[in-house]
Interface confidence: low
């Protein structure tokens, strides 16, 4: 079951998943001046048996040489529909991506990806948030969010974290990166 | 049994010093930030300032910024306030209360009444 | 930075509602979910009674809830009691990484 929203947004936050269960989607966006090929999947899927997960179906861009390049490619609608985002820059170490039963793993780029990868996430899944380069993390912890299914409808727990600015006047000094440590607080509503 | 217990009323006259403390108990004491609040006589909370005695880590209200020093003992799980220079204006109860998972207070200590009077 | 803001008092009869308004700013109750509640009964320290603008820690009450809309926030208290009389206060976390209490609301408890 697809999750209905986008996991939580934090300000000056990225998040990213550390292995994507079965099910979930990726949208074969492409940067801009280059397109998906007509006969291209519009995503991949992660899919499985008892002991092996993978994606299915391959992203592939290319040039839109003819075309107006100063325009972002536009996702088809189906595509935009329940557009799951997380940062591709800033990619987040939190673990080794060890191999979930169940989960694949991050799936390696193709040539001419756009910088955002765009997610549809299932009930299950989990991400996982840093704080962009610049802030740290007021709070030690991991700061985690869970797609979960309660009373028929999907949401996103809340995490554990909030940015900090180094640099901006009126802020305090944050502190070290978290490092998994037990208490980690809270989370922010953020403007969106 | 989490609590904080907090050292006992103070009556000081202006331009004295004073440290005041705040001893955890009953959790993991360094993994806690611990506030400081001000409630002067009959009147409402002021956010004084906060610290992680893990490391010292410190921020502090503007309003407080250079007034007060907010410091901490891992070691003894004892965060405490001082005054390098007391003032009348200072007399109010201070409280000292735990940051818990969701930023909010949710411990407090019971308050210690600092009174500064000539 | 300035205090939240709310109405000094309130009075009801017990068994009935009130609702308690706490505004800030899009810096602070605007902008995170961290706006908590506190009771604080005659002569004691502050007690925690909503945290994350709606959750009651455990042994709170569920007469005692909250919600939040734009830059306030506000507390509601069903089937009023007598022991419910105290001060009541918001706080919020806010952007410059400090924390800002409201004014407090006084709760009379009409008898």
């Known amino acids: 079951e697809l999750c209905d929203d986008d996991p939580p947004k934090i300000t000056h936050a990225t998040f990213k998943a550390v292995a994507y269960k079965e099910g979930t989607m990726l949208n074969c966006e492409c940067k801009r001046g280059f397109r998906r090929i007509k006969s291209g999947s519009p995503y991949m899927l992660c899919t499985g048996n008892s002991s092996h997960s993978s994606w299915d179906n391959q992203c592939q861009c290319t040039s839109s040489a003819a075309r107006n390049t100063t325009k972002q490619v536009t996702p088809q609608p189906e595509e935009q529909k329940e557009r799951k985002t997380t940062e591709m820059q800033s990619q987040m170490q939190l673990a080794d991506q060890v191999s979930l039963p169940g989960h694949c793993r991050e799936p390696p780029p193709w040539e001419n990806e756009a910088t955002e990868r765009i997610y549809h996430f299932v009930v299950g899944q989990t991400v996982y948030y840093q704080c962009v380069q610049g802030y740290r993390a007021l709070h030690r912890g991991p700061a985690e969010s869970v797609c979960k299914m309660t009373h028929g409808k999907t949401r996103w727990t809340q995490p554990q974290l909030i940015c900090t600015g180094e640099t901006e006047p009126s802020q305090f000094p944050g502190e070290e990166e978290p490092q998994a440590s037990p208490d980690g607080l809270p989370e922010s509503e953020t403007s969106r | 049994q989490v609590q904080l217990v907090q050292s006992g009323a103070e009556v000081k006259k202006p331009g004295e010093s004073l440290k005041i403390s705040c001893k955890g108990s009953?959790?993991?004491?360094?993994?806690?930030?611990i506030g400081w609040v001000r409630q002067m006589p009959g009147k409402g909370l002021e956010w004084m300032g906060i610290i992680y005695p893990g490391d010292s880590d410190t921020r502090y209200s503007p309003s407080f910024q250079g007034q007060v020093t907010i410091s901490a003992d891992k070691s003894i799980s004892t965060a405490y306030l001082q005054w390098s220079s007391l003032k009348a204006s200072d007399t109010a109860m201070y409280y000292c209360?735990?940051?818990?998972?969701?930023?909010?207070?949710?411990?407090w200590g019971r308050g210690t009444m600092v009174t500064v009077s000539s | 930075q300035s205090a939240l803001t709310q109405p000094a008092s309130v009075s009801a009869s017990p068994g009935q509602s009130i609702t308690i308004s706490c505004t800030g700013t899009?810096?602070?109750?605007?902008?995170?979910?961290?706006v908590s509640w506190y009771q604080q009964l005659s002569g004691k320290p502050p007690k925690l009674i909503l945290y994350d603008v709606s959750k009651r820690p455990s042994g709170i009450s569920d007469r005692f809830s909250g919600s939040k809309s734009g830059n306030t926030a506000s507390l509601t208290i069903s089937g009023l009691q007598a022991d419910d009389e105290a001060d009541y206060y918001c706080s919020s976390y806010t952007r410059s990484s400090t924390w800002v209490f409201g004014g407090g609301t006084q709760l009379t408890v009409l008898g």
């Open positions: 899009s810096s602070d109750v605007g902008a995170y979910i961290y």
């Open positions: 009953g959790y993991s004491s360094t993994s806690y930030w």
């Open positions: 209360a735990r940051l818990g998972s969701y930023y909010a207070f949710d411990i």
